[in-house]
C-alpha cells in the first residue's frame, strides 16, 4: 500500500538534487583554490542533515549551522553586490567585475542557486514530488530559511560601500517583502557600512525618468537613513551599454551617462 | 566511458575568427568545469581558460583576454572554443580538457583531453 | 603567475634502465589541505596529453606502477624505475595551485 504523502503547493526538490550539490561543490573548489581546504562530502552530509527527516515547515536557522561553518568563507568585505528581481544582470556584472561577489559567487550562494529541496517528517526520503510554498503553506520551510541564513550572514559581512542593483522594471522597485528588503538591509553593519549604492536598472529603451525619485526609493533610503548609514542612488538608464563599460572602461562612449 | 571529441582542422586568415567545438559524452556535462588548452608547434602546453557549463561562467588566462571566448551549450553538451582576431602565432593545437573526481574532490589534474584540434593561420 | 621549469629538455634512456625528470616550481606548490597540487603528464607522438600522477604522488586510473612523483614543496620528480619503449614522448609537470595552471618546457624522452 503506498504510504499517504503531504502534498505541498510548491514544485518538488529538483531532479538530481545530491548529484547536484556534490558536483558544485566540487566545480566550486576547483575553480576557487582557496576553498579547496573543505570536503564536499561533509559539505553534501551537513546540508541533508539540515532538511532531512525533519518537517519542511519547521526548518531553523539553526538546522543549517553546521552547512554554515563548512561553508565559512572571507569575501572582501567592501565588494559585495546585492541584488533584488534582477539575479542574471547581477551575475553578468560579476563575472565581468570579478573583484566583486554576490551571494552567489560564495560557495554556499553557488551551491543553492536556483534548487528547491525539502524532506519528510520522520522519513530519510528527499520529497520530489512537492515542497512548501513560502505563501501558500509556510516560511519556515527548507529552501527560504537557507537564503534567509546566507543572506543574513552575507549582509552582516558587509563593509564601506555595500551596493545593491534593483529592478526599475517593477512596480515596486525596492520591495519590503524580497530578501533584500527584509533580511539584508536590516543586518547590514551601521558601524562598517557607510554607504548603501543602489543601481536602479531601466527596462526599457525610451526610459529617461529619474527613478531615483520613486516612492519605494525613498522608502529604502528612509530605512537606510535611520540606521545610521549613508544611501545614494544611480539610474542604469542603459545596462547593455553599462555591462560594455565595464568590459571596456577605456571606450570613448563611456565617458556619458549610461 | 568519458569522451571528448573535437571539431575537424581548420585553416584560417590572418584577422578571422575560429570556433572549435568539443562534444563530450559518458558523463553529466554540467557536473564538471570545462578546460582549453593551446599547444603550438614545437612548443608546450598553454592554459587558454575554463567554463562552467551550468552557469556559463567562465575565466580565461590574461594573454588571450579580449580574444577568446568559451561557451557552453548544454542542450547538445558542447563546448565551444572562440579565438578571434587570428594572427601567425595562434597557428596550434587546441584541446578541451576535464578533471577527475576522486571521492568528492577535483583531482586538480586534467584527467581526460579531446584528441585535438589543429588550426592553421595562414594568408 | 607560477614558473614550471624542467630538466632536462632531452632525456636519451636505454630500455630497461631508470629514467629520471626534475621539475622546479618558483613558489610553494603546497596546498594548506595537505594537497600539493603538481601534475605530470606524457605525450606520446601524435597523442593528446595523458595525466600519469596528480598530487604530486597519487598514480592516475591505469598508470603503471613504474611511474611514481616525489617531491617537496618547490622541488618535483618523476621516476620510470625501468623505461619501456611505449614511454617515448614529452613528459610535462603542471601546477595547479592556483590560476592560471601553468606547465613546464616538457622533457623529452627518447630510447637510445
Known amino acids: 500500500v503506498p504510504r499517504w504523502r503531504q502534498q505541498w503547493s510548491g514544485p518538488g526538490t529538483t531532479k538530481r538534487f545530491p548529484e547536484t550539490v556534490l558536483a558544485r561543490c566540487v566545480k566550486y573548489t576547483e575553480i576557487h583554490p582557496e576553498m579547496r581546504h573543505v570536503d564536499c562530502q561533509s559539505v553534501w552530509d551537513a546540508f541533508k542533515g539540515a532538511f532531512i527527516s525533519k518537517h519542511p515547515c519547521n526548518i531553523t536557522e539553526e538546522d543549517y549551522q553546521p552547512l554554515m561553518k563548512l561553508g565559512t568563507q572571507t569575501v572582501p568585505c567592501n565588494k559585495i553586490l546585492l541584488w533584488s528581481r534582477i539575479k542574471d544582470l547581477a551575475h553578468q556584472f560579476t563575472q565581468v567585475q570579478r573583484d566583486m561577489f554576490t551571494l552567489e559567487d560564495t560557495l554556499l550562494g553557488y551551491l543553492a542557486d536556483d534548487l528547491t529541496w525539502c524532506g519528510e517528517f520522520n522519513t530519510s526520503k528527499i520529497n520530489y514530488q512537492s515542497c512548501p510554498d513560502w505563501r501558500k503553506d509556510c516560511s519556515n520551510n527548507p529552501v527560504s530559511v537557507f537564503w534567509k541564513t546566507v543572506s543574513r550572514r552575507f549582509a552582516e559581512a558587509a563593509c564601506d560601500v555595500v551596493h545593491v542593483m534593483l529592478n526599475g522594471s517593477r512596480s515596486k522597485i525596492f520591495d519590503k517583502n524580497s530578501t533584500f528588503g527584509s533580511v539584508e538591509v536590516h543586518n547590514l553593519q551601521p558601524e562598517k557600512v557607510q554607504t548603501l549604492e543602489a543601481w536602479v536598472i531601466h527596462g526599457g529603451r525610451e526610459d529617461s525618468r529619474d527613478l531615483c525619485q520613486d516612492p519605494t526609493i525613498k522608502e529604502l533610503e528612509s530605512i537606510i537613513s535611520k540606521r545610521n548609514i549613508q544611501f545614494s542612488c544611480k539610474n542604469i538608464y542603459r545596462p547593455d551599454k553599462f555591462l560594455q563599460c565595464v568590459k571596456n572602461p577605456e571606450d570613448s562612449s563611456c565617458t556619458s551617462e549610461i | 566511458e568519458v569522451q571528448l571529441v573535437q571539431s575537424g582542422a581548420e585553416v584560417k586568415k590572418p584577422g578571422a575568427t575560429v570556433k572549435i567545438s568539443c562534444k563530450v559524452s559518458g558523463y553529466t556535462f554540467t557536473d564538471y568545469i570545462m578546460h582549453w588548452v593551446q599547444q603550438a608547434p614545437g612548443k608546450g602546453l598553454e592554459w587558454m581558460g575554463w567554463i562552467d557549463p551550468e552557469y556559463g561562467s567562465t575565466d580565461y588566462a590574461e594573454k588571450f583576454q579580449g580574444r577568446v571566448t568559451i561557451t557552453a551549450d548544454t542542450s547538445t553538451d558542447t563546448a565551444y572554443m572562440e579565438l578571434s582576431s587570428l594572427r601567425s602565432e595562434d597557428t596550434a593545437v587546441y584541446y578541451c580538457a576535464r578533471v577527475a573526481i576522486i571521492t568528492t574532490v577535483a583531482s586538480g589534474g586534467f584527467a581526460y583531453w579531446g584528441q585535438g584540434t589543429l588550426v592553421t593561420v595562414s594568408s | 603567475d607560477i614558473v614550471m621549469t624542467q630538466s632536462p629538455l632531452s632525456l636519451p634512456v636505454t630500455p630497461g634502465e631508470p629514467a629520471s625528470i626534475s621539475c622546479q616550481s618558483s613558489e610553494s606548490l603546497l596546498h594548506s589541505n595537505g594537497k600539493t597540487y603538481l601534475n605530470w603528464y606524457l605525450q606520446k607522438p601524435g597523442q593528446s596529453p595523458q595525466l600519469l600522477i596528480y598530487?604530486?604522488?597519487t598514480r592516475a586510473a591505469g598508470v603503471p606502477d613504474r611511474f611514481s612523483g616525489s617531491g617537496s614543496g618547490t622541488d618535483f620528480t618523476l621516476k620510470i624505475s625501468r623505461v619501456e619503449a611505449e614511454d617515448v614522448g614529452v613528459y610535462y609537470c603542471q601546477q595547479f595551485l592556483e590560476y592560471p595552471p601553468t606547465f613546464g618546457q616538457g622533457t623529452k624522452l627518447e630510447i637510445k
Open positions: 598530487w604530486m604522488s
